[in-house]
Interface confidence: low
Amino acid sequence: IPVIEPSGPELVVKPGEMVTLRCVGNGSVEWDGPISPHWTLYSDGPSSVLTTTNATFQNTRTYRCTEPGDPLGGSAAIHLYVKDPARPWNVLAKEVVVFEDQDALLPCLLTDPVLEAGVSLVRLRGRPLLRHTNYSFSPWHGFTIHRAKFIQGQDYQCSALMGSRKVMSISIRLKVQKVIPGPPALTLVPEELVRIRGEAAQIVCSASNIDVDFDVFLQHNTTKLAIPQRSDFHDNRYQKVLTLSLGQVDFQHAGNYSCVASNVQGKHSTSMFFRVVESAYLDLSSEQNLIQEVTVGEGLNLKVMVEAYPGLQGFNWTYLGPFSDHQPEPKLANATTKDTYRHTFTLSLPRLKPSEAGCYSFLARNPGGWRALTFELTLRYPPEVSVIWTSINGSGTLLCAASGYPQPNVTWLQCAGHTDRCDEAQVLQVWVDPHPEVLSQEPFQKVTVQSLLTAETLEHNQTYECRAHNSVGSGSWAFIPISAGARTHPPDEFLFTP
């Protein structure tokens, strides 16, 4: 830690005297802060010397010396008083700026420590301090107003009693700024606007700030609009409101409107888009595919997005068939408004039954007319398999019918012994039917295919299984002929239900 000579901590001299302050450290040392021109500064090895041949009251202040190389960052200080009977105060700054609730140091330094007992703080021209002004005094630093308030932003003077008269310092202006937490708060109403050409419209841009020093403007595309500003103060905030009123809109009024407000902390901006249209419009769309496939027993939500101006005058969901004349229950239909001109309509179809496959239409109406959006709902089914023994053109044949959706694939398995299902170890042969015959393929219904296995391939006392599968699941049916071609209808005990 550096050492200052003389040792201090205070040194009192008279005006005109010579003053020498020497700072000595282990390494190089330096004096802190701005050194006034009245001082001569020179270095002498590990010491730094400040000297003046003609001390004045303006040299009154604390001089601090530091050793930059010191890892502990220590410093030494000495306070110099130049006691001038005519000048009891040395004011270091004529203006002090703080934020509310900070301590404000008014740097009027006493030039003579003896005068400390008779000091006081007053407002300009001797006016008393405002009530509740909490302050303290330090001869080294000046007066501190604690937790300064906005209203305490005034001109102050430091007063010292010299004999029987009070001697005032030059005035110090205290500016107390409100704490600005960020850019002004903004609202731009509405968030989006649509009007038909010739209609009236209004856009309101409002900003609020903790103090009055902020700017707000409304901009159309790249043009700042000249709009009268209405100012107000409520809820402890300053409000500025710009209202753009358009009696009859035209296409040139369309575009992007930005409400922009700025203060010392920065700027805040919010935008909205104004569309001007020739006539009423009504657009229906869906993010979903209009052709839907769902597994039977599962649920589905059908969603339609509506963009409309003016607003809807009516809407509903309708089941168009083909199976029953049921209509969707109103409780299963839900409407949500995303914003003024966009709505989402949802139809919930829980635990779908085969009779609920088909077409569902959403209809909406506004002054622009009617629009409809139709979904086609097909149910997916796992395959159902049946096998029969029949004679075709005099030959014994196994027929397998598989019904499901999507269309099932068919595979025949031959396995040893009698079983209701061929497992991997028992399989002797596998036949894949690449092109089963399509028996029926009606809209919104299962697809039924048929596969044939002829008698010459059949062997006595073996199990034949027809297996079908699709994306939903699989099904199978096993059959055991007693002797190839011996019977048209084998006994019931040889039919195995999967």
Partner: antibody, heavy 121, light 107 residues
């Protein structure tokens, strides 16, 4: 006239630390404007590094320096600081301190002359 | 982060020429854009703020325009002291970013 003078730059090894200072004269750093450090790698463009709000209560950092650099100020000395820790070769640049302009908010109307930081082993 | 792309990256012009530099933002930044001039070895100097407002003391031959994503700096009649590098900077939102710069050289 506002004057900003940076100091504290120099040669430092990777992983090392530096403290940059920016002494303001002709204007109090507590007077509401925000302050920032902006850097420029040799032969490259400008990169915003950090800002401190007018009240000193809010600080912002570029992702590239978050957790390594700290912006601060000493109102009594009217000085802005940038503490640089865990320095990397890519931190080599001239570091400018700048004052945020009032009307332009995030634009910078006064700049210092810059101080060069070289990170090299 | 918002990217600013300046074009061209460099240009050659003669004294008296009209020069236009563009700056495109990767997303809308309203009018929160500034333009700076920087000469070798010197700190940047603010020319335009809020996309089109001329900074005090800057010659009127400099002008800015644009909003949203596309901005332009125009020097109506290039002077010898205008040969420098020009940068755009956006300040809405954080983090603030600069364009890569446009160098204006003597033809």
């Amino acid at each position: 006239e506002v004057q900003l003078v940076e100091s504290g730059g120099g040669l430092v090894q990777p992983g090392g630390s530096l403290r940059l200072s920016c002494a303001a004269s002709g204007y109090s750093i507590t007077s509401g404007h925000h302050w920032a450090w902006i850097r420029q790698a040799p032969g490259k463009g400008l990169e915003w590094v950090s800002s401190i709000s007018g009240s000193g209560s809010t600080t912002y950092y570029a992702d590239s320096v978050k957790g390594r650099f700290t912006i601060s100020r000493d109102n009594s000395k009217n000085t802005l600081y940038l503490q640089l820790n865990s320095l990397r070769a890519e931190d080599t640049a001239v570091y400018y301190c700048a004052r945020g302009s009032y009307y332009g908010a995030g634009s910078f109307d006064y700049w210092g002359q810059g101080t060069l930081v070289t990170v090299s082993s | 982060d918002i990217q600013l792309t300046q074009s061209p990256s460099s240009l050659s012009a003669s004294v008296g020429d009209r020069v236009t530099i563009t700056c495109r933002a990767s997303q809308g930044i309203t009018s929160a854009l500034a333009w700076y001039q920087q000469k070798p070895g010197k700190a940047p100097k603010l020319l335009i703020y809020d996309a089109s407002s001329l900074e005090s003391g800057v010659p009127s031959r400099f002008s800015g325009s644009g909003s949203g994503t596309d901005f332009t700096l125009t020097i109506s009649s290039l002077q010898p002291e205008d040969f420098a590098t020009y940068y755009c900077q956006q300040y809405y939102p954080w983090p603030w970013t600069f364009g890569q710069g446009t160098k204006v050289e003597i033809k």
